[in-house]
Every structure is written in structure tokens, then in C-alpha cells.
């Protein structure tokens, strides 16, 4: 069956060193446990996180995301997932693409992460 992939309405903001959550879901909602779900970074399609055959596929991750990501699947039965990225870096800023693949049918949604420096301040005078 066909579906759309829905990402966040607006850019997501995070501070360097914090963790951030990138939500993604299918519409209409349905069980996505058996689907392939993933995030990659355009334009070079570097894999941020991949979930396939009911498991996280750590081996496919780009090195800069290894050990820093977690797919929250509490609501995957309704087609809703969240990617948690820990220890956010400046290099994480920019575009991410989330996709759901059901057999040969795939849809995706773009989202943007803005990363800010928690120690940034303007020097007086």
C-alpha cells in the first residue's frame, strides 16, 4: 500500500554536545515493524542510521555516526519512529532525509538540523 513520509514541520535546533531527536512517520499510519527505515545525509547519501529486518544495521553506518545514534521504536507499530543523535557536533548541521521502504515502495522526507554553540556570547563593548 502507498503512504507518505512526514518529517518535522520546522527545522530542529540542538546545542553542541547535547542529544537531539529527529521524528519521522508514515501517513496514513500503519505498522512499520517489517519495513526498512533509515536516515541518510544528502547529497552523498551517507547512512546515519538504518533499520532492516527488525534490527538496527550498525555496519552500514557512516563512521561519524557510529555509536551516536539510536532508533526509538516505541510507536513503530503505528508507523512512527524517532532518530536520537547523541553528542551533537557542528558537522551534524544541515539536511537529513528519512525514508520508509515497504518491499519495492519507498517514500522519504527531508528535514533540517540547526546546531548552535552553547558557549557563544557577544563580548561587551
Amino acid at each position: 500500500g502507498q503512504f507518505r513520509v512526514i518529517g518535522p514541520r520546522h527545522p530542529i535546533r540542538a546545542l553542541v554536545g547535547d542529544e537531539v531527536e529527529l521524528p519521522c512517520r508514515i501517513s496514513p499510519g500503519k505498522n512499520a515493524t517489517g519495513m526498512e527505515v533509515g536516515w541518510y545525509r544528502p547529497p552523498f547519501s551517507r547512512v546515519v542510521h538504518l533499520y532492516r529486518n527488525g534490527k538496527d544495521q550498525d555496519g552500514d553506518q557512516a563512521p561519524e555516526y557510529r555509536g551516536r545514534t539510536e532508533l526509538l521504536k516505541d510507536a513503530i507499530g503505528e508507523g512512527k519512529v524517532t532518530l536520537r543523535i547523541r553528542n551533537v557536533r557542528f558537522s551534524d548541521e544541515g539536511g537529513f532525509t528519512c525514508f520508509f521502504r515497504d518491499h519495492s515502495y519507498q517514500e522519504e522526507a527531508a528535514m533540517e538540523l540547526k546546531v548552535e554553540d552553547p558557549f557563544y556570547w557577544v563580548s561587551p563593548g
Epitope: 512526514i6 514541520r9 521524528p23 501517513s27 510507536a75 512512527k80
Partner: antibody, heavy 120, light 106 residues
Framework: EVQLLESGGGLVQPGGSLRLSCAAS????????MSWVRQAPGKGLEWVSA????????YYADSVKGRFTISRDNSKNTLYLQMNSLRAEDTAVYYC?????????????WGQGTLVTVSS | DIQMTQSPSTLSASVGDRVTITCRAS??????LAWYQQKPGKAPKLLIY???SLESGVPSRFSGSGSGTEFTLTISSLQPDDFATYYC????????FGQGTKVEIK
């Protein structure tokens, strides 16, 4: 089965306070944002407040900002609305609703509502 | 704030009629729109979300369409159980509801 059960409504004088509670069951409470929506007698629906699944982010309608406080206790699967400095125009049925997923989202499950009457 | 305007406010129809309710947003909300049905003394019930996705368990005679600022809810063949008040809701920036459309028996 998802269930939401509000309590705490009643009659209160203008300027008074009230705390509403919403007991949730049938889903992973901490994974969902939650909201309060109200409906004045014979009127339409008005979104009041929302809170993220972790409780770390809260949102308010301008009409209640500074007077109402939304909170949640994920260990008790319970949502709260503390209402202070109540006014006659706050009289309404207050519904607790599960956000479809994220903060300020669609509402896929609703409680039965609890009536708050502000009158002297 | 984003304002939502529904039309008509009241609609008189008969069983079997095709019914259309319109909702206009004061600015573009993409497809971040839902439709609810409410009966007297009851909580609202989600019918449509993301402008056109049918909520699980909702009869297929209900459908939604539109994007940007103009949206419609259509009931293809009105049933006795469908006489109620219908609300649209935007969730693009916080959440606001339309004023409601009451569908009554002609």
C-alpha cells in the same frame, strides 16, 4: 485500549485555583506529547496547552499564558493542568487529549471531559 | 496566530446526500490539517489527518483534500450517524480550530 480519564473539575470563584488530572492507560505514555483542549458551553474547541513526551517542552495558548501550568508524571502515567487566577471566561469542559505523536499535533484520543465552572 | 475559517456554519442535508465542508487557513499550513466529528455531550473524534489520511476505523465515505490554505471534508453519502458538528484544526504553528460546521437533518 487507549483510555484517558480526567478529574478535578468543579465550581470555583473568580481568582481561584483548580488542578485537573488526566490518568492515561493503554499506551506508552512517555512516548507521546499530551494536550488540554477546552470547550465553553455551546461554543467551539480551543487548544489550551501541550507538553512533550519527556515533559521538557511546554506550550500555551495566549489566553492562558502565565496563569495555567501543564505538567506530567510519566511514572504515574498522569497529565496535569494547574489553573490559577481563574476567570469567568475559563468556564468550559476541559478535555485531555493524546497528541498524535509530537507537540501541538493532531489529537487521536480524547478523554470524556471535566467541567470547570468559574462563578461567584 | 493562524486563523481557521469554516464554511458553511450550518448545513442542512438528507441521508444519502454528498456533503462538502470547506476550511480556509489565514496562511499556508501545507498539509498540517485535521478534521474532527463531535456529537452533543461527547468528545471530538479524529476523522482525517495530514489533510487526506483517513484515521483507522473511520468509514471510507469520509475523505479530505487540499493543501496550502484551502481544504475540504467530503462525506460521499450522508448516513444517519453523520449528523454532528465538524471541526477543522491546523497544527502547523501550535494548534487552532475552525469555528465548526453543524450538519443537521433537512
Amino acid at each position: 485500549e487507549v483510555q484517558l480519564l480526567e478529574s478535578g473539575g468543579g465550581l470555583v470563584q473568580p481568582g481561584g485555583s483548580l488542578r485537573l488530572s488526566c490518568a492515561a492507560s493503554g499506551f506508552t505514555f512517555s512516548s507521546y506529547a499530551m494536550s488540554w483542549v477546552r470547550q465553553a458551553p455551546g461554543k467551539g474547541l480551543e487548544w489550551v496547552s501541550a507538553i512533550s513526551g519527556s515533559g521538557g517542552s511546554t506550550y500555551y495558548a495566549d489566553s492562558v499564558k502565565g496563569r495555567f501550568t501543564i505538567s506530567r508524571d510519566n511514572s504515574k502515567n498522569t497529565l496535569y493542568l494547574q489553573m490559577n487566577s481563574l476567570r469567568a471566561e475559563d468556564t468550559a469542559v476541559y478535555y485531555c487529549a493524546r497528541d498524535y505523536w509530537l507537540d501541538s499535533d493532531y489529537f487521536d484520543y480524547w478523554g470524556q471531559g471535566t467541567l470547570v465552572t468559574v462563578s461567584s | 496566530d493562524i486563523q481557521m475559517t469554516q464554511s458553511p456554519s450550518t448545513l442542512s442535508a438528507s441521508v444519502g446526500d454528498r456533503v462538502t465542508i470547506t476550511c480556509r487557513a489565514s496562511q499556508s499550513i501545507s498539509s498540517w490539517l485535521a478534521w474532527y466529528q463531535q456529537k452533543p455531550g461527547k468528545a471530538p473524534k479524529l476523522l482525517i489527518y495530514d489533510a487526506s489520511s483517513l484515521e483507522s476505523g473511520v468509514p471510507s465515505r469520509f475523505s479530505g483534500s487540499g493543501s496550502g490554505t484551502e481544504f475540504t471534508l467530503t462525506i460521499s453519502s450522508l448516513q444517519p450517524d453523520d449528523f454532528a458538528t465538524y471541526y477543522c484544526q491546523q497544527v502547523y504553528i501550535y494548534s487552532t480550530f475552525g469555528q465548526g460546521t453543524k450538519v443537521e437533518i433537512k
